[in-house]
C-alpha cells in the first residue's frame, strides 16, 4: 500500500492501541445464580471495567479477534465441606463460540481446599487462580464457571473476578 | 491535529511504547519489617527492575495513568502454625491514592495453608498468587500486605515477588 | 534519523507490533519424561500456539530480546502421596542462557499438597500458578521444571500449561 | 510474668486414674499450645502431646494415645491432663509447657512439674 | 520417630574451661534455613529450662557464655566459660516432627 494508506493504517493503529481490549470483572452478590449457569459479574461499579470488550450473563464478548491473556480468581471458603461433595473443586474458563455447540475447556483447576481445615478450626479458606494467553474470534465469548459454586466466597470484588486484555 | 501533529504524536508514541511501563520487585531479607507495615522490595539486583514505574517504602509508584495488570506472589511456611494467627492469612495487593486517606483493596486471597502439614512433618509450605488488572493514575501507588507475615518466606528473589504492566 | 528513517522505523514497528511475541504451550502424555529433564509441552495442537517465539525440548526460545510476562500453571493430583517424597513439591520457571552453563531460577513455587486429602478420600487435588515478568535476550530459553513430577496430572491441555508473552 | 503452676503431688493405685491440672497466667492462654512432658525417675524426657487452647484439640505421641486425655477450660486458663489404668510405669514427674512457635515450637515455660507414684 | 543421639553421656570440666555437647538427628531437622533443633538445662529437682531455640538463638536472660550451632542433623552446645552453676543436665530436642523427641541427657559436672 501507498504511504497515504500506510499511514492511514498508522494512525489507525494508535487510536485502536489506545484502546487495547482489557477488562476486569469483579464478584458481587449476584455472581453465584444455583442456576447451573456460569458465575455472573459486576461490570461497571467499583474496579470494574470493560474497554473494547463487552459483557452478556457472565460470558466476556470478543469484538475484536486476538490473542488475550484471559485470567479469574475465585475465593474458596467454608466451615467443613457439604456432604456428598466430591473431593475435587473445579473452576474453570471456558469458550462459547458460534461455531461450536458446547463451550470449550481453556483453563481449568481442579483443587482439594476441604481439607485444609487447621486442627484449631473447620473453617477453611482456599483461592484458585488461573491465566493464560488464548486466540479468540470476534463475537466468541468466555466464561468462568465453578463447581460446586456453593464454595465461592464473595464479598467486596476484590477476592473473586475474571478478566482479559489483549496481548 | 494535522500531519505534522500526527507525526510528533506517533514520534512520541513509538517512543513511549519502547518502555511500555513494567517492573518486577523481588523479595529480599529485608521485606518484612514486622511493623505492620507493607512488604519491601528488592528494585535492582538480580530479576528485580523498573522501567517507566518508580518505587517508593514498599510501593510500586505510577508515573503514566492508564490500565496496569498488576500482581504478586509470596511464598508461605512454617514448622506448625502460630496459635492466635486466624486460620486465615491474607495476601492482598493494595492501591494508595492521594484523594483518599486509607489504602483501596484491589485484589486478595485467604487461604488457611496451616492445615496442610503431612502426617507427621510439621512443615508445610504454600504459595498464594495474586494478579489482575486495574486503572491507576499517575502518582497513586500499590502495595503487597500479608498478615500473617511472619509465613512468608524468603529466599532468593524467585518465590515472592511483586510487579506490573500496562496493558 | 531522519523522516524517511522514522517513517521505516515506524512501519516496522507497526509490522513487528502485529507480532508481538506471544506463545501457549499445553500439556501432553508426552510432557512427563521421567528423565530428569524439564517437562515437555504440545505447541500446536487445540490451545498451544508460538507466535513470534520458537520451542526446542520442553524450552520456550526467545526470538527477540524484551521484557516477557512467563507464566505456567500444573496440575498436582494423587492418591495419597509416594513414601519419601519430601513433604515439598517445587514448581519452577527456569532461564537457559549460552552466558552461563547452569539453569537459573525465574519465577518458583513450593508446595505442601499431599495433605490435602480430606478426612473421607486419600485423594487430593492442588494447582501451582507461576507468572511474573522477566528480561529475556534472543536465544535465551525458558523451562518448566517440577519436582516430584510423578504428582502432575495431565489430561487435555487445560489443566497444566506453560506461555508467555512480550509486554 | 508467665507461670504455670501444676498441681500436687499424687500417690494412686493400680488400675486407677489421675487428673493433673496445669493452671496458667501471665500471658494469653490461647495464643500458645500447652505440652505435656513425662519423665521418669532418673531418666530423659518424653513428648506426651499437645493440646490447643483456642478449641480444645488434642495431638498425642502415638505411645501415649490410650493413656492420656488431654482438655482446657479457657475460663480459667487451665490445661488439663488425665492419665488412666495407671501402672508403676506410670511413676513419673508429668510437666506442662507453653510451646513458643516464634521460637520454632520450643517449650519456653515450664511448669515445676507433678509427681505421680503408683503403687499399691 | 527422629532418634536424637546425644553425647557424651557425662563430662568434667574445669571451672573456666569449654564445655561442648554434640547432638546427632537420626534425619535433618532443618526447615529454611533454620534447625528446629532446642537445647534445655535440667538441674535436680527442678524442671527444665529452655537455653536455646531453632539451632542457634539465645533465650531471653541465658548468659552468653552458652552458644550453640549446626544444621541438619548435627548440632553442638557450647558453654564457655564454665561456671559452677553450671553442673546440670542437658537435652536436646527436635522440634520439626511428631512426635517431638528429647536426646537422652548429657550430664555436665565441674571439677
Known amino acids: 500500500d501507498g504511504p497515504a494508506g500506510s499511514w492511514e493504517q498508522l494512525i489507525q493503529e494508535r487510536r485502536s492501541h489506545e484502546v487495547n481490549p482489557a477488562a476486569h470483572l469483579t464478584g458481587a452478590n449476584s455472581s453465584l445464580t444455583g442456576s447451573g449457569g456460569p458465575l455472573l459479574w459486576e461490570t461497571q461499579l467499583g474496579l470494574a471495567f470493560l474497554r473494547g470488550l463487552s459483557y452478556h450473563d457472565g460470558a466476556l464478548v470478543v469484538t475484536k479477534a486476538g490473542y488475550y491473556y484471559i485470567y479469574s480468581k475465585v475465593q474458596l471458603g467454608g466451615v467443613g465441606c457439604p456432604l456428598g461433595l466430591a473431593s475435587t473443586i473445579t473452576h474453570g474458563l471456558y469458550k462459547r463460540t458460534p461455531r461450536y455447540p458446547e463451550e470449550l475447556e481453556l483453563l481449568v483447576s481442579q483443587q482439594s481446599p476441604c481439607g485444609r481445615a487447621t486442627s484449631s478450626s473447620r473453617v477453611w479458606w482456599d483461592s484458585s487462580f488461573l491465566g493464560g494467553v488464548v486466540h479468540l474470534e470476534a463475537g466468541e465469548e468466555v466464561v468462568v464457571r465453578v463447581l460446586d459454586e456453593r464454595l465461592v466466597r464473595l464479598r467486596d470484588g476484590t477476592r473473586s473476578y475474571f478478566g482479559a486484555f489483549m496481548v | 491535529d494535522g500531519p505534522a501533529g500526527s507525526w510528533e504524536q506517533l514520534i512520541q508514541e513509538r517512543r513511549s511504547h519502547e518502555v511500555n511501563p513494567a517492573a518486577h520487585l523481588t523479595g529480599a531479607n529485608s521485606s518484612l519489617t514486622g511493623s505492620g507495615g507493607p512488604l519491601l522490595w528488592e528494585t535492582q539486583l538480580g530479576l528485580a527492575f523498573l522501567r517507566g514505574l518508580s518505587y517508593h517504602d514498599g510501593a510500586l509508584v505510577v508515573t503514566k495513568a492508564g490500565y496496569y495488570y498488576i500482581y504478586s506472589k509470596v511464598q508461605l511456611g512454617g514448622v506448625g502454625c502460630p496459635l492466635g494467627l486466624a486460620s486465615t492469612i491474607t495476601h492482598g495487593l493494595y492501591k494508595r491514592t492521594p484523594r483518599y486517606p486509607e489504602e483501596l483493596e484491589l485484589l486478595v486471597s485467604q487461604q488457611s495453608p496451616c492445615g496442610r502439614a503431612t502426617s507427621s512433618s510439621r512443615v508445610w509450605w504454600d504459595s498464594s498468587f495474586l494478579g489482575g488488572v486495574v486503572h491507576l493514575e499517575a502518582g497513586e501507588e500499590v502495595v503487597v500486605r500479608v498478615l500473617d507475615e511472619r509465613l512468608v518466606r524468603l529466599r532468593d528473589g524467585t518465590r515472592s515477588y511483586f510487579g506490573a504492566f500496562m496493558v | 534519523d531522519g523522516p524517511a528513517g522514522s517513517w521505516e522505523q515506524l512501519i516496522q514497528e507497526r509490522r513487528s507490533h502485529e507480532v508481538n511475541p506471544a506463545a501457549h504451550l499445553t500439556g501432553a502424555n508426552s510432557s512427563l519424561t521421567g528423565s530428569g529433564g524439564p517437562l515437555l509441552w504440545e505447541t500446536q495442537l487445540g490451545l498451544a500456539f508460538l507466535r513470534g517465539l520458537s520451542y526446542h525440548d520442553g524450552a520456550l526460545v526467545v526470538t527477540k530480546a524484551g521484557y516477557y510476562y512467563i507464566y505456567s500453571k500444573v496440575q498436582l493430583g494423587g492418591v495419597g502421596c509416594p513414601l519419601g517424597l519430601a513433604s515439598t513439591i517445587t514448581h519452577g520457571l527456569y532461564k537457559r542462557t549460552p552466558r552461563y552453563p547452569e539453569e537459573l531460577e525465574l519465577l518458583v513455587s513450593q508446595q505442601s499438597p499431599c495433605g490435602r486429602a480430606t478426612s473421607s478420600s486419600r485423594v487430593w487435588w492442588d494447582s501451582s500458578f507461576l507468572g511474573g515478568v522477566v528480561h529475556l535476550e534472543a536465544g535465551e530459553e525458558v523451562v518448566v521444571r517440577v519436582l516430584d513430577e510423578r504428582l502432575v496430572r495431565l489430561r487435555d491441555g487445560t489443566r497444566s500449561y506453560f506461555g508467555a508473552f512480550m509486554v | 510474668e508467665v507461670k504455670l503452676e501444676e498441681s500436687g503431688a499424687e500417690l494412686v493405685k493400680p488400675g486407677a486414674s489421675v487428673r493433673l491440672s496445669c493452671k496458667t497466667s501471665g500471658y494469653t492462654f490461647t495464643n500458645y499450645y500447652v505440652y505435656w512432658v513425662k519423665q521418669r525417675p532418673g531418666q530423659g524426657l518424653e513428648w506426651i502431646g499437645e493440646?490447643?487452647?483456642?478449641?480444645?484439640?488434642?495431638n498425642f505421641n502415638e505411645k501415649f494415645k490410650s493413656k492420656a486425655t488431654l482438655t482446657v477450660d479457657k475460663s480459667s486458663s487451665t490445661a488439663y491432663m488425665h492419665l488412666s489404668s495407671l501402672t508403676s510405669e506410670d511413676s513419673a514427674v508429668y510437666y506442662c509447657t507453653r510451646s513458643n512457635w516464634d521460637y520454632g515450637n520450643a517449650m519456653d515455660f515450664w511448669g515445676q512439674g507433678t509427681s505421680v507414684t503408683v503403687s499399691s | 520417630d527422629i532418634v536424637m543421639t546425644q553425647s557424651p553421656a557425662s563430662l568434667a570440666v574445669s571451672l573456666g574451661q569449654r564445655a561442648t555437647i554434640s547432638c546427632k538427628a537420626s534425619?535433618?531437622?532443618?526447615?529454611?534455613?533454620?534447625?528446629?533443633m532446642n537445647w534445655y538445662q535440667q538441674k535436680p529437682g527442678q524442671p527444665p529450662k529452655l537455653l536455646i531455640y531453632?539451632?542457634?538463638h539465645l533465650d531471653s536472660g541465658i548468659p552468653a557464655r552458652f552458644s550453640a550451632s549446626g544444621s541438619g542433623t548435627d548440632f553442638t552446645l557450647n558453654i564457655h566459660p564454665v561456671e559452677e552453676e553450671d553442673a546440670a543436665t542437658y537435652y536436646c530436642q527436635q522440634s520439626i516432627e511428631d512426635p517431638f523427641t528429647f536426646g537422652s541427657g548429657t550430664k555436665l559436672e565441674i571439677k
Open positions: 534425619q535433618s531437622v532443618d526447615f529454611d534455613g533454620d534447625g528446629y
Open positions: 531453632k539451632a542457634s
Open positions: 493440646i490447643n487452647p483456642t478449641n480444645g484439640d488434642p
